[in-house]
Interface confidence: low
């Protein structure tokens, strides 16, 4: 079943995926699409990586992280309710039918008066076999491409406490990483 | 190696509309996640951060001068183009323009130029 | 918009003298945080990105560091062409914002 994720409109919706490349340069591409994941690719593309840079996106959904270190969690800018439902990460493992895909349902609350960021419990459930790259934030070398910054100012907590170096050794420590190679 | 070079008026008038040209080299907006845009400095003053724009024609504004600020590209020509309304005396300064990688520093600056709003 | 307060904001220095300049966010920005110099009459040049990162062809004299909302960034030896304005700039989020910069002066 997916793992569900919560963010009130206006706010900046943050889905978490992330895989361990077998060295720097050699990336895999990554697609995110809207709705679940079919049996190859992704539907309704909103974001696409490949062996070298980020390939394609639209204007609300960026990657924030390193990208090149295998974070490839989506940020949704200034979420509205049609954008609830389920996203799909697919990391596309070369061979047949290696690919490991995920299903993140995003769930927007409509906003309150004062907004309160919600916490995420049970980290352990945020990271179905997702965790690990050493890598959390801006692109090593800036020579190489990425996305352009996005407005977290109101960015849950879980999000913020994954910037956390401490909190993200603490993840990365606790087991499951996809490793490519 | 990369360039970028602002033109446009040194001198405009209030209430008129400032339109500046930057013309690059070196790179393309065709590249994914590059970015050109615009940052100005008020005499004495520090750096404010207008406008950007990406290859995929996403714009970003100040929230503060959205409503005046308009950026657009002409990626055959390698220019980016700003238009800047209404403009006031508080708008003197320097505008730089400038190039970054996604969500990276701004690593490549035009020489900047000056503009003056005064009647 | 985050803010970045820059100290101090102006000092002055020997050739030769450790230099440090700290810059504050105004909530954590992780490490998108990036240092420029400028000269009068001159655009502004990259440092250090991403707090610690130095940029190619700047020397090793200048390094950075900081996490969350507490950077700083260190002249080593300060040498006669490092007297400048150095501006911190978060790109953490949309708009992107600049220290009000600190002017290093010759004592």
């Known amino acids: 079943s997916e793992v569900e994720y919560r963010a009130e409109v206006g706010q900046n919706a943050y889905l978490p995926c992330f895989y361990t490349p077998a060295a720097p340069g050699n990336l895999v591409p990554v697609c995110w699409g809207k709705g679940a994941c079919p049996v190859f690719e992704c539907g309704n593309v909103v974001l696409r990586t490949d062996e070298r840079d980020v390939n394609y996106w639209t204007s609300r959904y960026w990657l924030n992280g390193d990208f090149r270190k295998g974070d490839v969690s989506l940020t949704i800018e200034n979420v509205t309710l049609a954008d609830s439902g389920i996203y799909c990460c697919r990391i596309q493992i070369p061979g047949i039918m290696n690919d490991e895909k995920f299903n993140l349902k995003l769930v927007i609350k409509p906003a309150k008066v004062t907004p309160a960021p919600t916490r995420q419990r049970d980290f352990t459930a945020a990271f179905p076999r997702m965790l690990t790259t050493r890598g959390h934030g801006p692109a090593e070398t800036q020579t190489l491409g990425s996305l352009p910054d996005i407005n977290l100012t109101q960015i849950s907590t879980l999000a913020n406490e994954l910037r956390d170096s401490r909190l993200a050794n603490d993840l990365r420590d606790s087991g499951a990483t996809i490793r490519i190679g | 190696q990369i360039t970028l070079k602002e033109s446009g008026p040194t001198l405009v008038k209030p209430t008129q509309t400032l339109t500046l040209t930057c013309t690059f080299s070196g790179f393309s907006l065709s590249t994914s996640g590059v970015g050109v845009g615009w940052i100005r400095q008020p005499p004495g003053k520090a750096l404010e951060w207008l406008a950007f724009i990406y290859s995929n024609d996403d714009k970003r504004y100040s929230p503060s001068l959205k409503s005046r600020l308009t950026i657009t590209k002409d990626t055959s020509k390698n220019q980016v183009v700003l238009t800047m309304t209404n403009m006031d005396p508080v708008d003197t300064a320097t505008y730089y323009c400038?190039?970054?990688?996604?969500?990276?520093?701004?690593?490549?600056w035009g020489q900047g130029t000056l503009v003056t709003v005064s009647s | 918009d985050i803010q970045m307060t820059q100290s101090p904001s102006s000092l002055s220095a020997s050739v030769g003298d450790r230099v440090t300049i700290t810059c504050r966010a105004s909530?954590?920005?992780?490490?998108?945080l990036n240092w420029y110099q400028q000269k009068p009459g001159k655009a502004p040049k990259l440092l250090i990105y991403a707090a610690s990162s130095l940029q190619s062809g700047v020397p090793s004299r200048f390094s950075g560091s900081g996490s969350g909302t507490d950077f700083t960034l260190t002249i080593s030896s300060l040498q006669p062409e490092d007297f400048a304005t150095y501006y911190c700039q978060q790109s953490y989020s949309t708009p992107p914002t600049f220290g009000q910069g600190t002017k290093v002066e010759i004592k």
């Open positions: 909530q954590s920005i992780s490490s998108y």
């Open positions: 400038t190039h970054r990688r996604g969500w990276g520093p701004f690593d490549y």
